[in-house]
Amino acid sequence: FPQDRPFEDTCHGNPSHYYDKAVRRCCYRCPMGLFPTQQCPQRPTDCRKQCEPDYYLDEADRCTACVTCSRDDLVEKTPCAWNSSRVCECRPGMFCSTSAVNSCARCFFHSVCPAGMIVKFPGTAQKNTVCEPASPGVSPACASPENCKEPSSGTIPQAKPTPVSPATSSASTMPVRGGTRLAQEAASKLTRAPDSPSSVGRPSSDPGLSPTQPCPEGSGDCRKQCEPDYYLDEAGRCTACVSCSRDDLVEKTPCAWNSSRTCECRPGMICATSATNSCARCVPYPICAAETVTKPQDMAEKDTTFEAPPLGTQPDCNPTPENGEAPASTSPTQSLLVDSQASKTLPIPTSAPVALSSTGKPVLDAG
């Protein structure tokens, strides 16, 4: 019992403070209407006014609306926090051509390097693909844009890189009605960059689904667009994304234009038999019985096996603190919590390896 530990109930009789068991210290009690900016505020400046959901407290102490990433060419990079706006960026496969505060006003699709060129720098959310001429060492398969989606490994071309600039959009001059033909041969496989749909007076929709620029004869700038629920694989083929429709699976990452959907076992289950981008067989997460102990192994990949505990040991299947509460820093998805009375398991990440501590408790290997 530490000598410097304050008197729990009253924090030495100071009504403006309270004792937080989780951090074992006295914390400043924020006045009514103000909320702590941290778990255990120490002074009045650690308290702030609470804004409405989707608002943040700006530098001038004003509640300001967080930007929204609801446009379909945007994804959330950082969430709306009490003191900072949500930050949006262009979704995978696109880059920002016109930036905006905490967001992007206009996203364009990454260019595909034309024939005779290879990718020097792949496109990011901020920058378009940078192409450079293929060096003599590049395989002949790179003679056409279809076969030259990625640079050949091992080749380091010396030529000066050529950034591919975004297509000049004509969409802003289009009438509100009619998209497909007025956008003169709107490419049936994504071209680089549709203009922002809002500029043609329509509600925002996925740029990949709205009229786009022409795909000129002989151009290498038209990215092949697969059907919904298909993705462009490394060989340039449209391949069906895996389905997570089985009851014991949940979607881990969505089906994107260039990557499959990935599935994982739902909370409370673990993968017994893995499969590409999914799990072929999920099993309920093992419960420690009184006379069994889980044998350490890679739980995410293999069937769980049980063996008798060493003589004289009693496995403890309740790794929670004595008061039955989880430590404040730990959430149920980060630690294995077993209710020893009800013998129920709480969710843990199905991909996390599980090991055993010296006491026989299952612990999460943070990797």
Epitope: E146, E185, A187, S188, P228, D229
Partner: antibody
């Protein structure tokens, strides 16, 4: 001007094969999916599949898979649909249609090719 | 596969009157904030002609009297004031899942 011109009508015996062509002009043939659609006499429309001429990638309707082969010749900007093991229910008009970008609609269609399967 | 149920099978409307055709999908056609529902018009001896894409966007060159609405699983095509040249078969199509499928068609005729 975008145009899709299909080959002429065919009369075939059951068990044989037919190959319908669709010549494209007025656009970058390699960069658009070419779809094929069946319409039996007095009936509705049935999607057969599609091909991306740029690399020969295909999607098929499972109902036709195994009997239908979609190919494309970039040099002549021509797409082909070959249907094998013909039976009487294959009698229909077959359309080729270009799929536009993004919204997956078919904006330009060929005039159609009537294939009659009769013994 | 996604089944599209189109109704009615046929529709007799007076010239100048409104005609509405419905199309119900067996599952949602939503995709990145839009619905992958298309509408085509087909006249005898001709290939289908694209009218509406993404459920409600009117293709260029298509008269203003045609409009599309709906989301999720329920969609409709409306001809606000029927003209003689609108006499045709109308088909809905979904592109949400492979294989793409069509509705059975609705025949629009003059009453």
């Amino acid at each position: 001007e975008v145009q899709l011109v299909q080959s002429g009508a065919e009369v075939k015996k059951p068990g044989s094969s037919v190959k319908v062509s669709c010549k494209a002009s007025g656009y970058a043939f390699s960069s658009y999916w070419m779809n094929w659609v069946k319409q039996a006499p007095g009936q509705g429309l049935e999607w057969i599949g599609q091909i991306y001429p740029g690399d020969g990638d295909t999607n098929y309707n499972g109902k036709f898979k195994g009997r239908v082969t979609l190919t494309a010749d970039k040099s002549s900007s021509t797409a082909y649909m070959e249907l094998s093991s013909l039976r009487s229910e294959d009698t229909a008009v077959y359309f080729c249609a270009r799929r536009i970008n993004g919204n997956f609609a078919m904006d330009y269609w060929g005039q159609g090719t009537l294939v009659t399967v009769s013994s | 596969e996604i089944v599209l149920t189109q109704s009615p099978d046929s529709l007799a409307v007076s010239l100048g009157e409104r005609a509405t055709i419905n199309c119900r999908a067996s599952e949602s056609l939503e995709y990145y904030g839009t619905s992958l529902m298309l509408w085509y018009q087909q006249k005898p001896g001709q290939p289908p002609k694209l009218l509406i894409y993404s459920a409600s966007n009117v293709e260029s060159g298509v008269p203003d009297r045609f409009s599309g609405s709906g989301s999720g699983t329920d969609f409709s095509l409306t001809i606000s004031s029927l003209e003689p040249e609108d006499i045709a078969m109308y088909f809905c199509q979904q592109r949400r899942k492979v294989p793409s499928t069509f509705g059975g068609g609705t025949k629009v005729e003059i009453k």
